[in-house]
Interface confidence: medium
């Protein structure tokens, strides 16, 4: 195909076997560097697209994607990644080949995806497509869906990246009641990527694969609803797309909507309006504002105004890095054996967290629920009243968060006794940690009520078995004298338990166990 420019796509790996390239079906490990990525031309209506072999990079690896062009003369170029334009500085080597490079250092999951290089030369215009996969320690990946405007039409495209390829669906609700949260009759599902019907009360796009399900809600201000008690806040990271919808209903068409950022009207081309009549002949208008790739200067108060409704605002905060805000201090709880109780963590985070509850090397599903004030809450109730340490673990692309909980179950002591030649000892579990008394059984005290005040040594919590503390108490023989019956008692708020020991015996010889509640 002689009219196509001769180009070469190369992978330069900055680490031994840190990355590999090949067709998605069978990745080859990189040993040498650089490596030819076998750019293959695909003719498309928009021009020629060269597709490089898929590159697989180990997490934290560093690579350079490079295109070498045999065609001499001036050239200009532009890298595009996740709909953000990145600078491009071509240079020429000693053989007068045009060289365009993109270095990707300390790769993380967020840098996985398609890198498009648009090249304009005197000979031709064309695009080179690199696909970079991060060899994640997780088996599967599922990224939160995001929105894009369809070219030349007022419709939303929902995009989700993941391995395996996620299926995408729109979940729409037209009810103002709680039923939107449930699998209620007001909820409609559309398993397609493009949505033209943008008037619903609640619009979200959900993506699902083997890893689970992730959803993104179209942020909406409804001028017919009373404003929230706290100003709604929307977080985004630099480079992400911003979508914010204003919705209003009026008795007739005689009203207009406008978006302003910090009292300045949004630029033409960064919003579009749609109108429709509802069944009762009222007019519904929506005004969708969007920024395909946000920067720090897109931060601020976005206000939707109407000629017939009170205006409402939302604060959009653009972050360099995601976050998880919550109190990480350890919490300890004490409950009865059959008491209903849930651990809970209240947090604010962006991007949305992945979380789990962990107990004793087993993990339990973590559900998050959004609160009115912009915070979220996760509760864990399925502890089956087992004592021990519970962990809430959350992570997103940029942050990790851990919170530890200790659950103690109130329990009456249960005493085990043991006697040796020199001492008698008793141990007991139970919570709260039991206190000890030793009593002498004699002619004077047949009911064993005479307390032994000396020679007793108490040792607290010497081991912790599955969250159960064990306490022990030892009686020195010389203090008590041989040939005696003694009684050790452990007591706490849940009751008392005693064991009687014959002190003459060298081995374990408890023969009476009393349980006094």
């Amino acid at each position: 195909n002689q009219d196509l420019p001769v180009i070469k796509c190369v992978l330069i790996s900055h680490e031994n076997n840190g990355s590999s390239a090949g067709k998605p079906s069978s990745y080859r490990m990189v040993r040498g560097s650089p490596e030819d990525l076998q750019c293959t031309p695909r003719r498309q209506s928009e021009g020629t697209v060269y597709e490089a072999a898929t590159v697989e990079v180990a997490e934290s690896g560093s690579i350079t994607l490079q295109v070498q062009l045999a065609t001499p003369g001036d050239l200009s170029c532009l890298w595009v990644f996740k709909h953000s334009s990145l600078g491009c500085q071509p240079h020429f080597d000693l053989q007068n080949r045009g060289i365009v490079s993109m270095a990707i250092l300390n790769v993380t999951e967020t840098q996985a995806g398609e890198y498009l290089l648009h090249i304009q030369s005197e000979a031709a215009n064309y695009t080179v497509l690199f696909t970079v996969n991060v060899r994640d320690t997780q088996l599967y990946v599922l990224r939160r869906p995001y929105f894009r405007k369809m070219e030349n039409q007022d419709a939303l495209l929902c995009i989700s990246e993941g391995v395996p390829e996620p299926t995408v669906e729109w979940v729409l609700c037209s009810s103002h009641r709680e039923s939107c949260k449930e699998e209620g009759p007001a909820v409609v599902r559309k398993e397609e990527k493009v949505l033209h019907e943008l008037f619903g009360t609640d619009i979200r796009c959900c993506a699902r694969n083997a890893l689970g399900r992730e959803s993104t809600k179209l942020f909406t201000i409804d001028l017919n609803q009373a404003p929230q008690s706290t100003l709604p806040q929307l977080f985004l990271k630099v480079g992400e797309p911003l979508w914010i919808r204003c919705k209003a209903i009026h008795v007739n068409h005689g009203f207009g909507l406008t978006w302003e950022l910090e009292d300045k009207a949004l630029e033409e081309g960064s919003y579009f309006e749609m109108s429709t009549y509802s069944t009762n002949r009222t007019m519904i208008r929506i005004l969708l504002a969007f920024v395909s790739s946000v920067g720090r200067n897109d931060t601020g108060y976005y206000t939707c105004s109407s000629s017939k409704h009170p205006s409402q605002s939302a604060l959009v905060t653009i972050l360099e890095k995601g976050f998880i805000n919550a109190t990480s201090s350890q919490e300890e709880y004490e409950i009865d054996p059959y008491e209903k109780f849930c651990f809970s963590v209240r947090f604010k985070a962006y991007p949305r967290i992945r979380c789990t509850w962990i107990f004793s090397q087993a993990s339990f599903p973590c559900e998050q629920r959004g609160l009115e004030d912009g915070y979220s809450i996760s509760k864990f109730c399925d502890h089956k009243n087992k004592p021990g340490e519970y962990i809430f673990y959350a992570e997103n692309d940029d942050a990790q968060f851990t919170k530890m909980f200790t659950l103690n179950i109130r329990k009456k002591p249960q005493v085990l006794a043991n006697a040796s030649a020199s001492q008698a000892s008793c141990s007991s579990d139970g919570y709260p940690l039991p206190s000890w008394t030793w009593k002498k059984c004699s002619d004077k005290s047949p009911n064993c009520t005479e307390e032994i005040p000396e020679g007793v040594w108490n040792k607290k919590a010497n081991r912790k078995v599955f969250g159960q503390w064990v306490s022990s108490s030892t009686l020195n023989m010389s203090e008590a004298g041989k040939g005696l019956l003694v009684k050790c008692c452990a007591y706490n708020s849940m009751g008392t338990s005693c064991e009687t020991i014959f002190l003459n015996s060298p081995g374990p010889f408890p023969f009476i166990q009393d349980n006094i509640s």
Epitope: T356, Q361, F364, E395, Q400, M404
Partner: antibody, heavy 121, light 108 residues
Framework: QVQLVQSGAEVKKPGSSVKVSCKAS????????ISWVRQAPGQGLEWMGG????????TYAQKFQGRVTITADESTRTAYMELSSLRSEDTAVYYC??????????????WGQGTLVTVSS | EIVLTQSPGTLSLSPGERATLSCRAS???????LAWYQQKPGQAPRLLIY???SRATGIPDRFSGSGSGTDFTLTISRLEPEDFAVYYC?????????FGQGTKVEIK
């Protein structure tokens, strides 16, 4: 790719202790659970316990409670399993295995090559 | 603890045949936290399926897992010569983790 490399075979006397190490190379270490699994000759797999190094939380199977100690050193990316009061029936191949999910526990997707511990007088 | 019982103990089949292995739990397995492993003589186990039905990286699609609650199945649609091995199920949803006793798939 993560690899787990275990210490070499051991021959021990009854009543003594053995400490097997498991060193991770590549990938993240601290936030992934490490399990210890043993397999006696001709027998099935038996889970002994595990640790999530980042949390320092350790869990032991009831059968091994009091005899096994599992630890981890994040600085050297190494997990250890120590079994005391050895008996002849502890003769087995001991495997360390890494969980597939960060920060939680999942199935064990990466395994060490195994360490044969022989207990014999 | 949850006891896992695998059946049959041994499965004698020819290459190309379909293998169905069963794993039954004494109590419901939390959130389908059930895995299947393959082990060949002298080798460490290899993860095939996790979450009852998700295939691990690099596992051929002839291996599939299904089930929830207390009954789980591993199916090998067409046995290849390299599939003859011992298969173990493991639950990791309730402490302590437990394994089934194994099913040996041997050549008939």
């Amino acid at each position: 790719q993560v690899q787990l490399v275990q210490s070499g075979a051991e021959v021990k006397k009854p009543g003594s202790s053995v400490k097997v190490s498991c060193k991770a190379s590549g990938g993240t270490f601290g936030s992934y659970g490490i399990s210890w699994v043993r397999q006696a000759p001709g027998q099935g797999l038996e889970w002994m316990g595990g640790i999530i190094p980042i949390f320092g939380t350790v869990t032991y199977a009831q059968k091994f409670q009091g005899r096994v100690t599992i630890t981890a050193d994040e600085s050297t990316r190494t997990a250890y399993m120590e079994l005391s009061s050895l008996r002849s029936e502890d003769t087995a191949v001991y495997y360390c295995a890494r969980d597939s999910w960060s920060g939680a526990t999942g199935a064990s997707d990466t395994w060490g090559q195994g360490t044969l511990v022989t207990v014999s007088s | 603890e949850i006891v896992l019982t695998q059946s049959p103990g041994t499965l004698s089949l020819s290459p190309g045949e379909r293998a169905t292995l069963s794993c039954r739990a004494s109590h419901s397995v939390s959130s389908s936290y059930l895995a299947w492993y393959q082990q060949k003589p002298g080798q460490a186990p290899r993860l095939l399926i996790y979450g009852a039905s998700s295939r691990a990286t690099g596992i051929p699609d002839r291996f599939s897992g299904s089930g929830s609650g207390t009954d789980f199945t591993l199916t090998i649609s067409r046995l290849e010569p390299e599939d003859f091995a011992v298969y173990y199920c493991q639950q990791y949803g309730s402490p302590p983790r437990t394994f089934g006793q194994g099913t040996k798939v041997e050549i008939k």
